[in-house]
């Protein structure tokens, strides 16, 4: 069944004498494998022999290949899928149909191609778009329908001639669809490509030329513009004459319309090549242009600077910056129209003319403050001299200047006193508008610049003010110099270091952290009564009976200080012990007998120990004995011993005496 | 060695006298250097101290004054040993009764005897 | 009569613990002032005497310190045999009295 049999190839293949031809090819035989192939060039069926006749290009059986024209022809295919066929070199006799006749077991097919082989290399077709601007990128496309892989070729672009320098990209097929060459090349072309060769060169692999194809580039674009102008400077004086004349060097397609512009902007009733101006002013001055339309869109001309020169006019002073700060730079310029631009200049402050000063720009890089004025120039050129304009006026601001504390009162201050004081200055820009004091205090500020303080503390040693307006200028501070009875009186124990025993060496000092004026009295007192006069008090060998409550006094011209009173505190070991006894040192036996250790000690006594008769020690360590129910073997003499960490003390000797009771003395 | 043997009755009724004995060996009743104590415990009391004995150039006692009234403490020189008597006993007397040295603390003491009052 | 209180009343540490008991005079009593420990069954032994001192034969690791009203007993690492309970005493003067106990337990 013939239907079985299906190819795909392209249909018609070109080449040239001596290259080469590749056939890309593909089938499919339903009923099972190719088992022969024949390649017939310009077949014709037999009906007689029922076979095809022709000349046999290629042979492929079960047998094996038949070599056939020296392997000029070669099947590149297989058994069941490709059918690929590759003829090189291609004779130009190869021309005209080639068959293909396929047998596998039980069917036979004839695919037929056509081959179409020229003497010379064919030329490649070069493609446009169909239209073309200037600056608007295209591609040009060359195509070849040929391509073959043992035969290699190049497509090269010229422009009159001449290679281009874009880089093009070639492509290849070698499909069973479609078989060519193809060279695009991505190009913006100018106005000045306009009717302009373009040639797509098809070359061997050596570069050597096979065939071209060629177009004229058609390049729409806006008209091309030369201006001219009398003068040729384009320089002239207010009431010349000048003529501007506009010509059209390219325009694709024709130009349809004529405009004049100046400094951007249209001039009316002016539409011809021509453009004539008389008795020119310097209003007139500017950039003038031609503006020529077509389809494409308006071209324009480059512009023309007319300079209408006259002399400098008024000029006005800018200053940069005003008002400006004591310390800070200035510029000053000067602004004047003219033309030419002015070559010298002379400035003025307040009405005076400024030395040397002939630059359009004045700079003052430290500014003071009699700089302060009026700035105005005058310009010249080689037209004439310019007017002095209104000038401009130039603030100075500093901070208030030579600022001052001035104490009003009458010296010496005494501590305690109301002191006023005032914040004086020399000048200012702009005016003071508040004062500052240092230190900061609960003072009150009757008026601007001046303070008052109450009760003027000893410690208030110097007070400063400033001035201020956008900035504070401090005075230096001034010395109140306050005079006041000492302070921090006090008594201070310098030797011993450690606690007073009774028999050390005492020296109290009388201190205090400061007086003013400096010369002082002292004043030691003991419970109303004065003891000395001197900075220290001293004790060669302190008694007990020194004990007490003491103060110093300091005093200067302007009053006196006490300290707080001290206590000197005398420790000793203890004194002065006895036993008493209670009820009385003649007890009844049976009854209670309670002996007690009198002592005077510093620090008090810890402990007391007991003694009898013999000296032998009793178990109790309190101030108190109590013999209870005491016996008549109690009776004898009984002493205590105090201990502080000082010391001991013993007492005397104290007899108890107990009698016998009325019992005993019945009994017996 | 100094130790303290106590001995008296476990068991006293009310209202009769408590009598305990407190012997001594390795140191002298007489010691004057020494007291002798009666000290008791009880749960609802803990410990406390009742009285002593000592000699010095003679005989001294102390008592606590909450048995004041009912106490005696004798010295024994001619067996080395001091007594302690309680008299007009309640249930509150039933304590531990301990004998014990005092020189500078209690340092030795006797085996402790509990004496119910019952 | 002076007053004895210890604190705390009663005590948990471990093994190791140093503990410290503390015990108040109602009055100053000088260094007059003695620790025991007891143990249940047995009779009061004396630790510390006159405050600080250590009583002959006991261990280095109980110590006392203080003199006037406040006293400190610090054993300095428990053993297993000091739990007990601990008295103060003081023999400043007549009557004698002694504090109501700390109860030192294993915690």
């Known amino acids: 069944d013939s239907s079985k049999w299906v190819f795909e190839h392209p249909e018609t293949l070109y080449a040239w004498e001596g290259a080469c031809v590749w056939i890309p090819c593909t089938y499919r035989a339903l009923d099972g494998d190719l088992e022969s192939f024949i390649l017939f060039h310009n077949p014709e069926y037999n009906k007689n022999t029922s076979k095809f006749d022709g000349t046999r290009l290629y042979e492929s059986t079960k047998d094996g290949k038949v070599p056939s024209e020296q392997k000029r022809v070669q099947f590149l295919g297989d058994k069941n899928k490709n059918c690929t066929l590759s003829i090189h070199p291609v004779h130009l006799n190869d021309s005209g149909q080639l068959g293909l006749r396929m047998e596998s077991k039980t069917e036979k097919w004839m695919e037929r191609i056509h081959l179409n082989v020229s003497e010379r290399p064919f030329p490649p077709h070069i493609q446009l778009p169909p239209e073309i601007q200037e600056s608007q990128e295209v591609t040009l496309t060359c195509l070849l329908n040929f391509s073959c892989y043992g035969y290699p070729i190049q497509l090269q672009w010229l422009l009159e001639g001449v290679p281009m320098r874009q880089a093009a990209v070639t492509s290849t097929s070698l499909t069973i669809k479609s078989v060519f060459t193809r060279s695009e090349l991505k190009f913006s072309p100018q106005w000045s490509h306009h009717g302009k060769i373009v040639t797509c060169q098809l070359q061997d692999a050596d570069g050597k030329f096979l065939s071209n194809d060629t177009v004229q580039l058609n390049v729409k674009h806006t008209p091309k513009l030369e201006i001219k102008v009398t003068p040729s400077d384009a320089i002239v004086r207010e009431g010349d004459s000048v003529t501007m004349t506009c010509e059209v060097s390219s325009s694709n397609p024709e130009y349809t319309t004529v405009s004049w512009l100046k400094d951007g902007t249209s001039l009316k009733k002016q539409n011809t090549f021509t453009l004539n101006l008389r008795e020119v002013t310097k209003d007139q001055s500017g950039k003038y242009c031609c503006q020529v339309s077509n389809d494409v869109g308006p071209g324009r001309s480059e512009e023309v600077f007319l300079q209408v020169q006259y002399a400098p006019e008024p000029s006005t002073v800018q200053i940069l910056h005003s008002p400006a700060v004591e310390g800070s730079q200035v510029e000053f310029l000067c602004m004047s129209l003219a033309n030419p631009l002015p070559t010298n200049y002379t400035w003025y402050h307040n009405g005076k003319e400024m030395q040397g000063r002939t630059e359009e720009k004045v700079h003052i890089p430290k500014i003071l403050p009699w700089h302060a004025g009026t700035y105005s120039c005058v310009a010249e050129n080689i037209l004439g001299t310019g007017q002095r304009g209104p000038g401009a006026e130039l603030d100075v601001q500093y901070p208030p200047k030579k600022v001052t504390t001035v104490i009003q009162n009458p010296m010496p201050i005494r501590e305690g006193d109301t002191v006023t004081l005032s914040c004086n200055y020399n000048s200012s820009n702009p005016s003071v508008t508040r004062y500052e004091w240092k230190p900061h205090g609960a003072w009150e500020e009757p008026s601007l610049g001046v303070l008052k303080i109450q009760n003027v503390g000893w410690d208030n040693t110097t007070i400063a003010c400033a001035a201020c307006n956008s900035w504070c200028s401090w005075a230096s501070p001034v010395a109140l110099n306050v005079q006041y009875a000492p302070r921090d009186v006090r008594v201070r124990k310098i030797k011993p270091l450690s606690e007073i025993h009774s028999g050390n060496s005492v020296s109290l000092q009388c201190d205090f952290s400061s007086s003013h004026p400096k010369e002082v009295q002292f004043f030691w007192e003991k419970n109303g009564r004065l003891l000395g006069k001197e900075s220290q008090l001293n004790f060669d060998s302190i008694s007990p009976e020194d004990a007490g409550s003491y103060s110093c006094w300091v005093n200067n011209s302007i009053g006196q200080t006490a300290s707080k009173a001290w206590t000197l505190e005398v420790l000793y070991a203890p004194r002065r012990l006895r036993v008493s006894m209670s009820p009385g040192d003649q007890v009844m036996e049976g009854k209670s007998a309670t002996l007690t250790c009198e002592s005077d000690a510093n620090p008090p006594v810890s402990h007391y120990t007991w003694f009898d008769w013999n000296n032998q020690s009793l178990p109790y360590h309190s101030q108190k004995l109590r013999l209870e129910p005491v016996k008549v073997q109690h009776s004898g003499a009984y002493w205590c011993q105090g201990t502080n960490s000082v010391g001991k003390g013993r007492s005397p000797l104290s007899t108890l005496t107990v009698y016998y009771s009325p019992e005993t003395i019945g009994r017996r | 060695q100094v130790q303290l043997q106590q001995s008296g009755p476990g068991l006293v009724k009310p209202s009769q006298t408590l009598s305990l004995t407190c012997a001594i060996s390795?140191?002298?009743?007489?010691?004057?250097?020494?007291?002798w104590n009666w000290i008791r415990q009880s749960p609802s009391r803990g410990l406390e101290w009742l009285g002593r004995?000592?000699?010095?150039?003679?005989?001294?006692?102390d008592y606590a004054v909450s048995v004041k009234s009912r106490i005696t403490i004798n010295p024994d020189t001619s067996k080395n040993q001091f007594s302690l008597q309680l008299s007009s006993v309640t249930p509150e007397d039933t304590a531990v009764y301990y004998c014990?040295?005092?020189?500078?603390?209690?340092?030795?003491w006797g085996q402790g005897t509990l004496v119910t009052v019952s | 009569d002076i007053v004895m209180t210890q604190t705390p009343s009663s005590l948990s540490a471990s093994v190791g613990d140093r503990v410290t008991i503390t015990c108040r005079a109602s009055?100053?009593?000088?260094?007059?002032l003695n620790w025991y420990q007891q143990k249940p069954g047995k009779a009061p032994k004396l630790l510390i005497y006159?405050?600080?001192s250590l009583q002959s034969g006991v261990p280095s690791r109980f110590s006392g310190s203080g003199s006037g009203t406040d006293f400190t007993l610090t054993i300095s690492s428990l053993q297993p045999e000091d739990f007990a309970t601990y008295y103060c005493q003081q023999s400043y003067s007549t009557p004698i009295t002694f504090g109501q106990g700390t109860r030192l337990e294993i915690k």
């Open positions: 390795g140191d002298s009743v007489s010691s004057n250097s020494a007291a």
């Open positions: 004995t000592y000699y010095r150039s003679a005989w001294y006692n």
């Open positions: 014990a040295r005092d020189v500078e603390g209690f340092d030795y």
């Open positions: 006159a405050a600080s």
């Open positions: 009055q100053s009593i000088s260094s007059y």
